[in-house]
Structures are given as C-alpha cells and as structure tokens.
C-alpha cells in the first residue's frame, strides 16, 4: 500500500432524500465486485485518503429508460461529480447530460487531495439504476 | 514484465455465426496499433493470465448507423462485457445500451483472475464498425 | 520523472480558425485543474517526450445544445483524436460522432512515441463548450 | 425453418392497384425488416421499399408516391400496396429478409407474385 | 444512386475451369471496415439465392468453390472449379445506402 495504490470502484445503494441529489455509494468484496482500497466511504460518499492525481470514472444508466423518456417527457437528466467537501475545495470535475441516451458514462485525470470527499449529483425525474453493471463509479491514484 | 504490467488493445476481427453474439477480436503490431503484453487470445476473446485488479475499457461503433437506425427502426442494440469463463465466475461486468446513438464507450475498474476469459456480446441487428478507430476493447493490469 | 510518469490533463483553450477543424488546449494549475506532467504544448496541440503505452481519454460537451441541434438542424459532428505529426505517423486513433447527444467521452490504449503530436478535430457546425468539466483532455503514460 | 410465403394476383389492368400479402414463419416482424424486390425483363432486379420493425417504412424514391406498406405482427404479415400501374410495372414481386442484421442483403426471399399488367 | 455494372454480360466456361465475374460501382461501396457487395446466383423460376455477402462470406450452404473479393468499387465472384449446376444468371448488389441497387446480371453457360 505504500506505494500509493489507493484505488476504489463502488457500486449503487440508493439515491438520496427528496432535496438531496447525492448518490449513495456503496463498496466490498461482499456486496459483487466493488471494493475499497485505500478511500473510504462516509455516509455513502467517497474519500481520498491519499494526494494525488486520480483517474475518475463513472457510468450511469437511468432505470426503465427509452430515448423517449430521456427527451421530451422528462425533466433534462445530469450527472455531475464533484468535489463537495471541504467546502473551500468545493468544484465540478466532470458534468455530463443524458439528452435522448439512457447511460452516460466517462472518465478524467484529476488532482485530489486527502480528506476530499467526491459527490455524485444526479438531477432529474428519473431514477439510477442499481444493477452492477450498469451503474458504478471509481478512482484510481495514477501518480504522486 | 514481472511488475504485472499486463495490458493489451484489442481490434475487431469479426462477429460470431448466427447464434453467437459474441464479438471476435484479434491484436498484434501487424494488425495495426492493436497488442497484447501479457493477456491472450483464445478464438477471439481475451484471456486473463495475471490476477489483479484491471482497468477495463470499450468502445463499440455500429456499422452505417444514424439515430434513427437505433431508435425505433431497429432491435434494441445492447453491448455487454463479462467474464464468460470459467463458468464458476461467469458475471456481466460492463452493459450499455445504444439507444439513440451509434457509439457506446466506458470503462470500469474489476478484479480479474488468471484464466478469466472475457467476452463482448453485441445483441441486436446491427453491425459493429470494423475501423480501428471506431470499435476497440482493452484491460490494463492496475495492481494487485 | 525518471519512472516515466508522463501525464497531461487539457481545457479547451479555443478552437481554430475557418479551415482548421483542431481544437487548441492549455494546461497548467494557474488555469484550474490541468496540468502537464512530461508532455508539452506546442500551439495548443500535446506532444509526447516519451515512448510507451499510453491511456488517451477525452471528453467533449458541444455549448448550446440539445438533442435536436445534433440530429437534423446540423451537419454531423464528429471528434477524431489523432497522431497529426510527424506526418510519416499520422493516424486516427479515436473517432466518434455525435448523434443525437451532446456530448462524447472515450478512452482507449495506444501507443505513442516521443515527438508525436496529438490533434483533435472538431467537424460539424456546433461550438464545443469551455467549461472544464464538460470538456477536457488528457493522457498518462501507463507502461514501456 | 424461415419462411415467406407470398400471396397476391396475377394480371391487373392498367391504372389499378396492386396488393401482395407476405406471411412470415420462424421469426418475429417485431424484430425484423421485410423488404420488397421485383425484377423485370426490363429493369431488372429492383428494390422498392422496406418496413421496419416498428412500422415505419423506407421507399425506393422514384416510387414513393405509388408505394405503400404496412403490417400485421400478430398475424405475421406484410402487405404490399402499389397505386396507378403501367404496364411497365409488369414483374414478378418479392418480399425478402436479411438472416441476422438490418442491413439490406436477402438469404431469405418468398416464391415471387407474377404480376402482369396488361389491357 | 450507386450503379453497379457487372461484365461480361454472358460467358460460356468449361466444367472444371474457373469463371469469374466482375461487379463495378459508381461510388464506393465500403464504410466500417465492410464493403457492402453482395452476390446472388438465380435460375429460371426461382428467387435470387444469395451466395456471398460482405464481399467475401460464404452463405450457410454455399459451396466452397464459389469466392469474392475486392473492396471500394471493384468486386469479383469467382467459381472453381465450375460445375454443371452453376449454370445461372449471378448478379451483385450493394446495401452501402438506400436504395440498394443490383447490377445487370451476368448469365454463366456451360460449354
């Protein structure tokens, strides 16, 4: 671990209460193949415990979608992940739309410091799905 | 290559007869800028031979596709990556729909284990693209 | 340095004049989150200083846009990220269109030599949005 | 095994329309197109139009305002419809499919509708 | 549209001998890494049957001896060794867009 391997990959355990657009994370061996290796989970949301540049993941599929649903019928969907705490650190790092697809899914290079905690806002009328291998998110420290 | 630096890059060489929906994938420096450092093919589909956890990635583009040969026109089009083999360890790691686009992409962060055999199943009634630069599949050992 | 730890993550600075279809980048902690770790810029385009393995990844959000600015209002928009020079390499490594989304994000495993110079064009009648968290640009040098 | 078995008429006077029927068996028109083919002395082998999955229908452009197709799924059939005949439209009529893909290239095709169009 | 034009028109070969036929397209018939051409085989009364698609896939059942190739707009079928029931009109088609168009038809005979 000293070589600063720190790496994580989680899957979905729920959205968040009615105002909070947060997704909630959750990762172990237990649960399939997610898993935590150096960050850490609070409150369902994912720490860095370690400084470095990160490769930032993510996929997101929207449940019981159609391109239709996507569209016209529904408010416009984003993903954006994020910085959230501590506050004076606060930033989008990546925002993606859904438009008329069902799953956006992407990846950046990105400085993260100890004790920044990563938010995953999800806004719109329609829920993630919670199948592993449709929606998840990661890190991966690439450098020092 | 004892530091565990498996990765390869993988081109499409053809789809499966009738019944099989995998994709058939082939690499090497003859083919272009396609390799294979450590994992291996056997008929086609790409095998595991160091545990640890990968970085796995594709993209797939559909043959002389628009959106509305996604949409409504045509079978819904799914790509899944998993592992098919051994059947023990048989799991759906990755899976995207098209819907109204022609390209999916993404990529995810799973432990592996020697012997795994990956495979790509393209379901629907289109074609995937068989330029090098539209249609490729790859993993990168990350750590152990 | 010496581990060859090359790692480049760009913002869009601008995008070319009439004819040239090349969106131009910078990079550097003064501009936000990118930086250039080994790579360099060379009037907005990213040149390689190392051989090896590399992991290219970009993502692209067009500014102002819905899913019907990109299906009939609009001539087809396509990225295609490239080895522009030397121009013995020159090569589409990863190319993807547009559709009816607004935006792309991919990644893929190529191999780059020192002096390879990395253009990434734009086509289509859309402006690509200058928000670092819609669209970004990077690489990291993953093995020899 | 797949089949298209096609039904239809023989002679038909000039300026009448023309109506094919193609039952399917072994597949699902919710998941596959049926295209329309007719070869003449004249023409040759010549492509008309196509009906997709989900009803909608791509035509053979120099034909469009004469063509018309439409479909049955639960009871596995295409139809065929063809206004204003000449006698240059004097074919044998073919509804065909593709194995596997949407793409436009048949192994399967029905017997073929004569169709004679004469005064 | 893409015109496809087939030569010769007619050829007699000899059994046992190799007959080959050549298919010409107004404009490019390949895009995703496919070229777009196919052949068919049609006898008196029947239906076309399609003997190769993607320019060179053998359909199920299709004898060996028959084979194509070529790629942007020139394409060959080729039979060897030829056999008394190849004796048919064999016609290529492209599917790159629509519509898709066939070619004239080149009729094989047996000397």
């Known amino acids: 671990e000293s070589l600063g391997w720190d790496i994580a990959e989680l899957q979905l355990n729920h959205t968040g209460p009615q105002q909070d657009p947060r997704l909630y994370w959750q990762g172990g061996p237990a649960l399939g193949r997610s898993f935590l290796r150096g960050p850490e989970l609070d409150k369902g949301q994912l720490r860095i415990r370690r400084d470095g540049i990160y490769m930032v993941h993510i996929q997101v599929t929207l449940a019981i979608c159609s391109s239709t649903s996507t569209s016209r019928h529904h408010h416009p969907t984003t993903l954006a992940v994020g910085i959230c705490s501590p506050a004076s650190r606060s930033i989008s790092l990546l925002r993606l739309s859904f438009h008329q697809g069902c799953t956006i899914a992407s990846q950046r290079l990105t400085p993260l410091a100890r004790g920044d905690t990563l938010c995953t806002n999800l806004t719109g009328t329609l829920l993630p799905s919670r199948n592993t291998d449709e929606t998840f998110f990661g890190v991966q420290w690439v450098r020092p | 290559e004892s530091l565990g630096w498996d990765i390869a890059e993988l081109q499409l060489n053809h789809t499966g007869p009738q019944q099989d929906p995998r994709l058939y994938w082939q690499g090497g420096p003859a083919l272009g800028r396609s390799f294979l450092r450590g994992p291996e093919l056997d008929k086609g589909q790409l095998r595991i031979r160091r545990d640890g956890i990968y970085m796995v990635h594709i993209q797939v583009t559909l043959a002389i596709c628009s959106s509305t040969s996604t949409s409504r026109h045509h079978h819904p089009t799914t790509l899944a990556v998993g592992i098919c083999s051994p059947a023990s360890r048989s799991i759906s790691l990755l899976r995207l729909s098209f819907h109204q686009g022609c390209t999916i992409a993404s990529q995810r962060l799973t432990p592996l284990a020697r012997g795994d055999t990956l495979c790509t199943n393209l379901t629907g009634t289109l074609l995937p693209s068989r330029n090098t630069d539209e249609t490729f599949f790859g993993v990168q050992w990350v750590r152990p | 340095e010496s581990l060859g730890w090359d790692i480049a993550e760009l913002q869009l600075n601008h995008t070319g004049p009439q004819q040239d279809p090349r969106l131009y980048w910078q990079g550097g902690p003064a501009l936000g989150r990118s930086f250039l770790r080994g790579p360099e810029l060379d009037k907005g385009q990213l040149r390689i200083r190392r051989d090896g393995i590399y992991m290219v990844h970009i993502q692209v959000t067009l500014a102002i846009c819905s899913s019907t600015s990109t299906s009939r209002h609009h001539h087809p928009t396509t990225l295609a990220v490239g080895i522009c020079s030397p121009a013995s390499r020159s090569i589409s490594l990863l190319r993807l269109s547009f559709h009816q989304g607004c935006t792309i994000a991919s990644q893929r495993l190529t191999p780059l030599a020192r002096g390879d110079t990395l253009c990434t064009n734009l086509t289509g009648t859309l402006l690509p949005s200058r928000n670092t968290d819609e669209t970004f640009f990077g690489v990291q040098w993953v093995r020899p | 095994q797949v089949q298209l078995k096609q039904s239809g008429p023989g002679p038909v006077q000039p300026s009448q329309s023309l109506s094919i029927t193609c039952t399917v068996s072994?597949?699902?028109?919710?998941?596959?197109?049926i295209h329309w083919v007719r070869q003449s002395p004249g023409k040759g082998l010549e492509w008309l139009g196509v009906?997709?999955?989900?009803?909608?229908?791509d035509y053979n452009v120099a034909l469009m305002s004469r063509l018309n197709i439409t479909k049955d799924n639960s009871k596995s059939q295409v139809f065929f419809k063809m206004n204003s005949l000449q006698t240059d439209d004097t074919a044998i009529y073919y509804c065909?499919?593709?194995?596997?893909?949407?793409?436009?290239?048949?192994?399967?095709w029905g017997q073929g509708t004569l169709v004679s169009v004469s005064a | 549209d893409i015109v496809l034009t087939q030569s010769p028109a007619s050829l007699a070969v000899s059994l046992g001998q190799r007959a080959t036929i050549s298919c010409r397209a107004s404009?490019?018939?390949?895009?995703?890494?496919?070229?777009?051409l196919h052949w068919y085989q049609q006898k008196p009364g029947q239906p076309p049957k399609l003997l190769i698609y993607?320019?060179?896939n053998l359909e199920s059942g299709v004898p060996a001896r028959f084979s194509g190739s070529g790629s942007g707009t020139d394409f060959t079928l080729n039979i060897h060794p030829v056999e008394e029931e190849d004796a048919a009109t064999y016609y290529c088609?492209?599917?790159?867009?629509?519509?898709?168009?066939f070619g004239a038809g080149t009729k094989l005979e047996l000397k």
């Open positions: 404009k490019s018939v390949s895009a995703s890494g496919y070229s777009f």
């Open positions: 088609q492209h599917s790159r867009d629509f519509p898709p168009t």
């Open positions: 072994d597949f699902s028109l919710t998941i596959f197109g």
């Open positions: 065909a499919k593709n194995r596997r893909y949407d793409y436009a290239w048949f192994p399967y």
């Open positions: 993607l320019t060179s």
């Open positions: 009906i997709w999955r989900d009803g909608s229908t």
